[in-house]
């Protein structure tokens, strides 16, 4: 008789999830010499321990604490790049500007990027059929709690000038319900962070509007100012040129507005 299995509204665990996490860990530690000491089997065991045999709507930050300990890493606090709804460009940027870091440039962020996972209460099985959706099922699911935990701690670690890349093509350039808007903004430490600088990325080639005047950006400015952190904003009118100029800053065309 087949065992009854809870049907959730979200997609199931990414196929080959254990192998993927382990392989990513090995690759990361090979690329980053300062992380060579990391025991990837222990990292996987800690990751697995956070959600296996637990109800996937009852996961806590504490469940991930053993994994957090193993993911200890030096991140220059003044070189942090946050992003919202524009992950690919943010990652392209840090691949060129190697001294800056998004969360996904850290071991823990790299391990989990674009993956889904969940288990089932009282069984050691991984659920490959379905996992809880944040809206339709529950917010305390394994994926959401993981990202909330690491995002909060990443923001808490930031200092001096913190940059955030925002998608100027979206109706809400700053979205209070995004991870950036709901977690990271509120966990920047005013005693450590002097300025939050937003980079609003334009989508259309002929779009010359000043998106820093957008009402949602003004809302972000208000939230940040109330937290005694300064706010500045820049339009990136030509993201392709922006990346090109990061690669080749001496190029004569890079002195003009991008």
């Amino acid at each position: 008789v087949p065992r009854w299995r809870q049907q959730w509204s979200g997609p199931g665990t990414t196929k080959r999830f254990p192998e993927t996490v382990l392989a990513r860990c090995v690759k990361y530690t090979e690329i980053h010499p300062e992380m060579r000491h990391v025991d990837c089997q222990s990292v996987w065991d800690a990751f697995k321990g956070a959600f296996i045999s637990k109800h996937p709507c009852n996961i806590t930050e504490e469940d991930y604490q053993p994994l957090m300990k193993l993911g200890t890493q030096t991140v220059p606090c003044n070189k942090i790049l946050l992003w919202s709804r524009i992950k690919d460009l943010a990652h392209q940027f840090t691949q060129v500007q190697r001294d800056m870091f998004t969360l996904e440039d850290t071991l823990l962020g790299y391990l989990a990027d674009d993956l889904t996972w969940c288990g089932e209460f009282n069984t050691s099985k991984i659920n490959y059929q379905s996992c809880p959706d944040w809206r339709k099922d529950c917010s305390n699911n394994p994926v959401s709690v993981f990202w909330k935990t690491v995002s909060r701690r990443f923001a808490e670690a930031a200092c001096d000038v913190v940059h955030v890349m925002l998608n100027g093509s979206r109706s809400k350039i700053f979205d209070k319900n995004s991870t950036f808007g709901s977690v990271e903004v509120h966990n920047l430490q005013p005693e450590k962070v002097q300025t939050l600088e937003a980079w609003v990325i334009h989508g259309g080639r002929e779009d010359s509007r000043d998106l820093c005047q957008d009402p949602t950006i003004k809302e972000l400015e208000s939230i940040i100012s109330k937290r005694n952190i300064q706010f500045s904003c820049k339009n990136i009118y030509r993201p392709d040129k922006f990346l090109q100029c990061v690669k080749n800053p001496e190029d004569s065309s890079c002195t003009s507005e991008i």
Epitope: K69, T72, Q73, T106, K192
Partner: nanobody, 117 residues
């Protein structure tokens, strides 16, 4: 600006004890959880222990549990690490840092602990 100054390291025989101190300034010390992390020669950063702002909650790496004790004196803006039953593998530069990790940017110079017979 967050500033920390670690002290108390030195050369000690296996089984011996040391007490590390970390004097903090430039921020509201009692509002911040704090951690001790260490870096052994040729190795990466390892989290050792953490403590909440009030001092009421502490946590330890499995490798030091039962041997090390973290504490703080908020009136003196100082963090401590009492290290007992020291082992050769505890040899490292020890840093104190704000936060509970896993992301650290230590501001101090650290203090070297050498355990050797």
């Amino acid at each position: 600006e967050v500033q920390v100054l670690e002290s108390g390291g030195g050369l000690v025989q296996p089984g011996g004890s040391l007490r590390l101190s970390c004097a903090a300034s430039g921020f509201t010390f009692s509002s911040y959880a704090m951690s001790w992390v260490r870096q052994a020669p040729g190795k990466g950063l390892e989290w050792v222990s953490g403590i909440s702002g009030s001092g009421g909650t502490t946590d330890y790496a499995d490798s030091v549990k039962g041997r090390f004790t973290i504490s703080r004196d908020n009136s003196k803006n100082t963090l401590y690490l009492q290290m007992n039953s020291l082992r050769v593998e505890d040899t490292a530069v020890y840093y104190c840092a704000d936060g509970t990790g896993p992301f650290f940017d230590y501001r101090g110079q650290g203090t070297l602990v050498t355990v050797s017979s």
